[in-house]
Amino acid sequence: PPNRRTCVFFEAPGVRGSTKTLGELLDTGTELPRAIRCLYSRCCFGIWNLTQDRAQVEMQGCRDSDEPGCESLHCDPSPRAHPSPGSTLFTCSCGTDFCNANYSHLPPPGSPGTPGSQGPQAAPGESIWMAL
């Protein structure tokens, strides 16, 4: 379809780099959540940091191109990186408007499918981009 994709946009304080240039921020009449209309893809992404007690959103926005996973209707995150011991970054890509607003489910930390606790470690800013 010719219509452009619209995604939730969020970047946690302290996250290095920005994906704001991948779209056009919309005026939605409310301060949060912010919406972004994608320029270069029809694909949204989300990144969550899962620790023992909670999942915290790190980034949400548009991808820079359509890639595998973008055909998904919903945000089904998969583990990507370990920013620090005891936490795991989960990312999703999906291809419907605002599909990155929330995830369908996250596996509990340390469950099968999540990288082992001895997996690669990275500084917080770097790990976001590893996840993307």
Epitope: P2, N3, R4, L26, T28, R37, L39, Y40, S41, S65
Partner: antibody, heavy 117, light 111 residues
Framework: QVQLQESGPGLVKPSETLSLTCTVS?????????WNWIRQFPGKGLEWMGY???????SYNPSLKSRITISRDTSKNQFSLKLSSVTAADTAVYYC??????????WGQGTLVTVSS | DIQLTQSPSSLSASVGDRVTITCRAS??????????MHWYQQKPGKPPKLLIY???NLESGIPSRFSGSGSGTDFTLTISSLQPEDFATYYC?????????FGGGTKVEIK
Amino acid sequence: QVQLQESGPGLVKPSETLSLTCTVSGYSITSDFAWNWIRQFPGKGLEWMGYISFSGSTSYNPSLKSRITISRDTSKNQFSLKLSSVTAADTAVYYCAGSRYSWFAYWGQGTLVTVSS
Amino acid sequence: DIQLTQSPSSLSASVGDRVTITCRASESVDTYGNSFMHWYQQKPGKPPKLLIYRASNLESGIPSRFSGSGSGTDFTLTISSLQPEDFATYYCQQSNEDPYTFGGGTKVEIK
């Protein structure tokens, strides 16, 4: 500031391939923006042809999709247009344009391409 | 594709006149209440110059006598007091859907 300049032959024979290059100065084409080709027919109508993004992805006008290729040379900070199987209907002024958003803030001066034998 | 129809196709006006140009889209160019319609000015031998983006936002460096309004399918470019340098052709452009399309232009001539 961002400056763009088109270059290429002003005369192309029917059925041949039109080739134009846009040289960008004052900004890296890999930093940001979509880098577009837009043409203006003698009757003054404007047509967006397509773009190559800062990351190298392309998007084309479906009316031209089978004939158009936009590519880039990052070492020269240039992007190029190739339009195959041209006819007299492709005679136009061809502009390159840079867009941070979905409107066109930066334009080259344009180059007239005539398709004639 | 979204068709944009501008009216009038040409008009004659005098310096100091208030000029209104309209652009009608074949379907809505709004996304969640945001209008993706833009306006350009073109003088002979020159490329188009951006005046207004997203229906009503004045591009940096453009005089405040230019303004834009509208939503959905109907949009207006207004020049509140026409100046000698404003005699030119004006185009609308939509970017709500691919491919981006332009209106046919409105030529503003000296009366």
